[in-house]
Structures are given as structure tokens and as C-alpha cells.
């Protein structure tokens, strides 16, 4: 939802968390503001305190329940409001009718581990975290490998067009240090975006076998 120079963006992690960022040019830094969540067909509502993340933007997490509980469904609509204190009163600064499963951003994949490493290849696995059972297998992943002397931005993206929680990296250089990251995205949702990148996993390929003396 955008009002002039105000921007209010929220994402649902598919289970029990809605993360919101509100930015407004010229807003007072010391103003106390909150995000209020009112589902259209649930008995609960939730509030979180917006905390500054930069000069003109604030963020907060609406914790709806235990991390793996399915607190919202595909047909829920949540009214989200930014409310800021003005003296003794609260003023509404932004509002949106939020369809959780159209605005998804999952948690970063976790538990990355090297399953098997050789001189030129490495098999890596991971797990998805706090992802709804709704998705079944309809998720996709992006992965990238950091090579020596390069940056993450230069790393080519590898796309896995299905729910495949492992990858076999090929054509690696022997006895070389690498780092690996992965992120996940459901197919569902018009405004759905990629999860954050996972924590990097560092690994080293095995040295090449020494050639036999002739």
C-alpha cells in the first residue's frame, strides 16, 4: 500500500509470522508506531511495535503463534494498519487488505550440510523451515556458489524448479575453499518473493590424487 511518500509492505512466512516494513519521508524518528493485524474471520488480532531500521523506515514482526502452526489459511484476508501515537490519540498512517498467500516470503533454508565431497564435485542438502504443508511439492529453489576471488553478486544462479532439497555441484576445482547458499520461493502468490539467502555453508574439495612416478 503506497500513500504519497509512504510505503507499507508486508510478507507472510506461510505459518505464523507476518513481517512488515513501513517507510515515510519526513516522519518523526521518535514517534511511537505499531502495526495492527485484524483477520476478517478469526477471533484474534495482533500488534507489533515498529522499530527504526533506517532514517525513514521501520520494521516489525507480527508473531501469530508458535513457529510451525498454521495461523492463516488461503482464504483469510487480514486488515493491516500502521498506527502512530499523536499525543493521547492514535492516527492511522497506512492500511492494506492483506491476502497472506498472495504475499509470501518463506524463511531462509536451514541445516545446510555437505553430504559427500570429492575433488570436482560436492553434494549438499538443506531443509526448509516453517513452510506450510499447503505447498506440497510446489516450491522452487535458487542456489549459488562462491568461488575464490569472486563476490556473491558474481556467482551464477542455479535454479531448481521443484522441491528438491539437495544439489550436486559439479566441475569444482580440487583442494579449493567454496561457500554455498540457497533460497526458496513458493509458486503461489502474485507478490510472493524469494526467501532470504541461507547462511553460507563453507566446504573444501578434496585434493587431486598425486600422479604416480614414472
Amino acid at each position: 500500500a503506497v500513500n504519497g511518500t509512504s510505503r507499507f509492505t508486508c510478507f507472510y512466512n506461510s505459518r505464523a509470522n507476518i513481517s512488515c516494513v513501513w517507510s515515510q519521508d519526513g516522519a518523526l524518528q521518535d514517534t511511537s508506531c505499531q502495526v495492527h493485524a485484524w483477520p476478517d474471520r478469526r477471533r484474534w488480532n495482533q500488534t507489533c511495535e515498529l522499530l527504526p531500521v533506517s532514517q525513514a523506515s521501520w520494521a516489525c514482526n507480527l508473531i501469530l503463534g508458535t513457529p510451525d502452526s498454521q495461523k492463516l489459511t488461503a482464504v483469510d484476508i487480514v486488515t493491516l494498519r500502521v498506527m502512530c501515537r499523536e499525543g493521547v490519540r492514535w492516527r492511522m498512517m497506512a492500511i492494506q487488505d492483506f491476502k497472506p498467500f498472495e504475499n509470501l516470503r518463506l524463511m531462509a533454508p536451514i541445516s545446510l550440510q555437505v553430504v559427500h565431497v570429492e575433488t570436482h564435485r560436492c553434494n549438499i542438502s538443506w531443509k526448509i523451515s516453517q513452510a506450510s504443508h499447503y505447498f506440497e511439492r510446489h516450491l522452487e529453489f535458487e542456489a549459488r556458489t562462491l568461488s575464490p576471488g569472486h563476490t556473491w553478486e558474481e556467482a551464477p544462479l542455479m535454479t531448481l524448479k521443484q522441491k528438491q532439497e539437495w544439489i550436486c555441484l559439479e566441475t569444482l576445482t580440487p583442494d579449493t575453499q567454496y561457500e554455498f547458499q540457497v533460497r526458496v520461493k513458493p509458486l503461489q502468490g502474485e507478490f510472493t518473493t524469494w526467501s532470504p539467502w541461507s547462511q553460507p555453508l563453507a566446504f573444501r574439495t578434496k585434493p587431486a590424487a598425486l600422479g604416480k612416478d614414472t
Partner: antibody, heavy 117, light 107 residues
């Protein structure tokens, strides 16, 4: 292999209630959604509702809300759809299906219900 | 309730030729549109999800596309087993609704 096996054909009188079962195998029933769809001769496919076995919630389409009840028995991996106050226009094939909320990935073979006096 | 309108009601095409089936939504549904195939005496089978993503195990000759509220299912080279009824279904607003179907028959 994913399978959904439905109970047999039923003939009912107007005003009666029918209860159809859907026994599933090949996937984790406790973490799944089971949907029910009606296919009546003149009306095409109509989504009746679903049960979310993990969350323990049901969702019914407005057109069926006051007459349909969807339940599940997780001990036998079986879902049920009960339709009450039957009328002639309820004569149809009823399907159970598995899927996320948005589309139906696997279907049962269908159960024919005939409502006739 | 969103109304899904499929056209034509019946489409006659020769084997080996291309078939184009249309589905229009009565309001904007983003890419929340899915296609099914149904053969006589059988349950529907899911073919395409989110307008254009094909389901694993479905032949590559089936493809989907979208232009606004108009969605198209294309079968590039018809095989004998493709002659069936095709349904579209929206999942943008509950209750989710199906089109009335397009019957694809042998010319």
C-alpha cells in the same frame, strides 16, 4: 503411489442424508488437505469444500455451507463428506481429491449419488 | 463469485494439429488459474498450474499462457489420447470456481 478410493454408488430419497468415504494411501494424511467436488450433469464441477487435517479446520463453499459436513479419521486415513436434505439436483458424481488449497493434484474415482423418490 | 467462461464449448481438430482452448475470468485473478483434463468415466487430471507451470508427468505438448484475464491452453500436436474435456479453475477468490469445459473432439 498416491491413491484415493471412494465408497460405492448410493441411491437416496429426497430429504435424506448421504455420507461418502474416501480412503487414502501413499501420502501423509495427517499433513494433507482433502477436498470434495460435485459434478452434476447440468452444472459442471463445483468445489464443495475441504478439510485441513493438520490445522483441524474445514472450509465450505457458500453454496453448500448449510448442508455439507466434511470430517476425517486420521486413525484410518479416511475422509468423509456428508450431504443432508438431499434434493433431485444433488444427483451427481462426488469426488474427493488431494491438493494444496488452490488446485487438486490427485482425485478419487468418484461416487455416483442418485436422488430419486 | 468469479465466473470462468471457456470457449469454444466444442472444438474439432484433426490428430497431429494444434488445439487452442480459451478461458476467461470475470475479474482479475492474477495467475491463479489451473487446467484439468477429463476423459469419459474418469476423474479430472491436473495438467497446468498458475497459468503456465506444467505438472511433472504431463507431456511437453501441453502449455499454458495468460494475457490479462484471458488464459490459453495449447496442445501443440494432438495425440489420440488428448481428445477429452478440458476445464479451467480459478483459485484467486473463494469459492474457487471451474469453467463449464471445452470438449475437444476428433475432426
Amino acid at each position: 503411489e498416491v491413491q484415493l478410493v471412494q465408497s460405492g454408488a448410493e441411491v437416496k430419497k429426497p430429504g435424506a442424508t448421504v455420507k461418502i468415504s474416501c480412503k487414502v494411501s501413499g501420502f501423509n494424511f495427517k499433513e494433507s488437505l482433502i477436498h470434495w467436488v460435485q459434478q452434476a450433469p447440468g452444472k459442471g464441477l463445483e468445489w464443495m469444500g475441504w478439510i485441513d487435517n493438520e490445522a483441524g479446520e474445514t472450509e465450505y463453499a457458500p453454496g453448500f455451507q448449510d448442508r455439507v459436513t466434511i470430517t476425517a479419521d486420521t486413525s484410518t486415513d479416511t475422509a468423509y463428506m456428508e450431504l443432508s436434505s438431499l434434493r433431485s439436483e444433488d444427483t451427481a458424481v462426488y469426488y474427493c481429491a488431494r491438493g494444496g488449497p488452490w488446485f487438486l493434484s490427485y482425485w478419487g474415482q468418484g461416487t455416483t449419488v442418485t436422488v430419486s423418490s | 463469485e468469479i465466473v470462468m467462461t471457456q470457449s469454444p464449448a466444442t472444438l474439432s481438430v484433426s490428430p497431429g494439429e494444434r488445439a487452442t482452448l480459451s478461458c476467461r475470468a470475470s475479474q482479475i485473478i492474477s495467475n491463479n488459474l489451473h487446467w484439468y483434463q477429463q476423459k469419459p468415466g474418469q476423474a479430472p487430471r491436473l495438467l497446468i498450474i498458475y497459468g503456465l507451470q506444467s505438472i511433472s508427468g504431463i507431456p511437453a505438448r501441453f502449455s499454458g499462457s495468460r494475457s490479462g484475464t484471458e488464459f490459453t491452453l495449447t496442445i501443440s500436436s494432438l495425440q489420440s489420447e488428448d481428445f477429452a474435456v478440458y476445464f479451467c479453475q480459478q483459485s484467486n477468490n473463494w469459492p474457487y470456481t471451474f469453467g463449464q469445459g471445452t470438449k475437444l473432439e476428433i475432426k
